[in-house]
């Protein structure tokens, strides 16, 4: 689709190769309270239920990230039985976090990508029989 | 659990109230290639399938974010029919993005929280009977 140029041509585009490598970040987070309507019970009500595990790292922002682990390999059917004709799989998302650059640290951070499992979904398996 | 203090006491903890409000960020992203094993077909194989919509904003980093929209209100059963005894619901995650602070922009960004739908899962509905 090509790069969309911001109004001010002196501002590099954030999707651009020329996006600055060192930038100043204001950490007064915008939208601090997103309409998060925590799907707090989806992990139990899902046919592919999951447990949430706390991943904590004081050298990272945010320091706490919750990761999903599917409870079963199969999916829970209408009778409450785990059916292996279907598969529970994690839905993963790449997120950005800030990582302290060094122990000497001042106010210097590095942007880091993390792949986290957000929840699970039930899929039809791909069955491969022996030739 | 309390705040875990980093080795160097002069470094504020990233989970702390005193975490610096203005920090320098190196945008040479760590883990640029996460083991993303893109679950590229889960959105079609799921019993709660979803479509992916491109959300583009040149004033944001990352400039492109993919958002999931559940295809059905119900879930797809073994016969390939949509069953409304179950519900497709979006799994949402709060992510961090960088927002250009102003059109005059130099290298100044603000951290912003966004709530994005990553995929969908099939849940048993909560049935509320009339009193």
């Amino acid at each position: 689709a090509g790069i969309v140029i911001p109004q001010n041509p002196e501002c590099p585009n954030t999707g651009d190769k020329n996006f600055p490598q060192n930038v100043k970040i204001n950490l007064n987070v915008l939208n601090r309270k997103t309409n998060s309507r925590r799907a707090s019970d989806y992990h139990n009500r899902s046919t592919s239920p999951w447990n949430l595990h706390r991943n904590e790292d004081p050298e990272r922002y945010p320091s706490v990230i919750w990761e999903a682990k599917c409870r079963h390999l199969g999916c829970v059917n209408a009778e409450g039985k785990v059916d292996f004709h279907m598969n529970s799989v994690p839905i993963q998302q790449e997120i950005l976090v800030l990582r302290r650059e060094s122990q000497n640290c001042p106010h210097s951070f590095q942007l880091e990508k993390m792949l986290v499992a957000v929840g699970c979904t039930c899929v039809t398996p791909i069955v491969r029989h022996m030739g | 659990a309390g705040i875990v203090i980093p080795q160097n006491p002069e470094c504020p903890n990233t989970g702390d109230k005193n975490f610096p409000q203005n920090v320098k960020i190196n945008l040479n992203v760590l883990n640029r290639k996460t083991n993303s094993r893109r679950a590229s077909d889960y959105h079609n194989r799921s019993t709660s399938p979803w479509n992916l919509h491109r959300n583009e904003d040149p004033e944001r980093y990352p400039s492109v974010i993919w958002e999931a929209k559940c295809r059905h209100l119900g879930c797809v059963n073994a016969e390939g029919k949509v069953d409304f005894h179950m519900n497709s619901v979006p799994i949402q995650q709060e992510i961090l993005v960088l927002r250009r602070e102003s059109q005059n922009c130099p290298h100044s960004f603000q951290l912003e929280k966004m709530l994005v739908a990553v995929g969908c899962t099939c849940v048993t509905p909560i049935v509320r009977h009339m009193g």
């Epitope: 239920p49 079963h72 390999l73 039985k81 598969n87 994690p90 398996p125 069955v127 022996m130 | 194989r45």
Partner: antibody, heavy 120, light 112 residues
């Protein structure tokens, strides 16, 4: 340490039902599943059923109509009931813990087994 | 059901030799999540089975490093680099990707 111990009747008459209890220690049934596996004399292993940590179950479909599994988390016990026994149900019956630290889906600790003979 | 075919049925070895057991499944054991739930157990005479290798190649705690597992999809191998007297018994391969979970018929490792 992790332990599982099966207790059963030993001898069962044909067409009667079998009830076996697996008593566990060293782990919790709210965190781990428990499988039942049997082994006829001099033969291989046959998986029967599992009750997962959340109380859901998965049965071997070939035996599903004759099997029933349940548990009592507070008593640390898992129960297997099997109906309409025939002589070819004679076997050593084992309970085994489902190893789900890291989601490996293997049976990491087994009981010593309880011998069941179906005979009149 | 997934059929697990183990070879050989009997494996006579001399102590100190290398031993190799093969197992083939009738369908791929790769789960939709990308993992392969294939395992090896050892049952010594008069004892219950013990987990040796889980998820193809991971040694269970306390298992000596002379045991190694490999393979993918439908073909798997267990190798014992130097057989010791305590390794004798029946080795079973197993899968838990598909229900019902199934076992191979067993390979008896015995002294030549």
């Amino acid at each position: 340490q992790v332990q599982l111990k099966e207790s059963g009747p030993g001898l069962v008459a044909p067409s009667q039902s079998l009830s076996i209890t697996c008593t566990i220690s060293g782990f919790s049934l709210t965190s781990n599943g428990v499988h039942w596996v049997r082994q006829p004399p001099g033969k291989g292993l046959e998986w029967l059923v599992v009750i997962w940590s959340d109380g859901t179950t998965t049965y071997n479909s070939a035996l599903k109509s004759r099997l029933s599994i349940s548990k009592d988390n507070s008593k640390s016990q898992v129960f297997l009931k099997m109906n309409s026994l025939q002589t070819d149900d004679t076997a050593m019956y084992y309970c085994a813990r489902h190893y789900d630290r890291g989601y490996y889906y293997a049976m990491d600790y087994w009981g010593q087994g309880t011998s069941v003979t179906v005979s009149s | 059901d997934v059929v697990m075919t183990q070879t050989p049925l009997s494996l006579p070895v001399s102590l100190g030799d290398q031993a190799s057991i093969s197992c083939r499944s009738s369908q791929s054991l790769v789960h939709s999540n990308g993992n392969t739930y294939f395992h090896w157990y050892l049952q010594k005479p008069g004892q219950s089975p013990k987990l040796l290798i889980y998820k193809v190649s991971n040694r269970f705690s306390g298992v000596p490093d002379r045991f190694s597992g490999s393979g993918s999809g439908t073909d798997f191998t267990l190798k014992i680099s130097r057989v010791e007297a305590e390794d004798l018994g029946v080795y079973f391969c197993s899968q838990s990707t598909h229900a019902p979970f199934t076992f191979g018929s067993g390979t008896k490792l015995e002294i030549k």
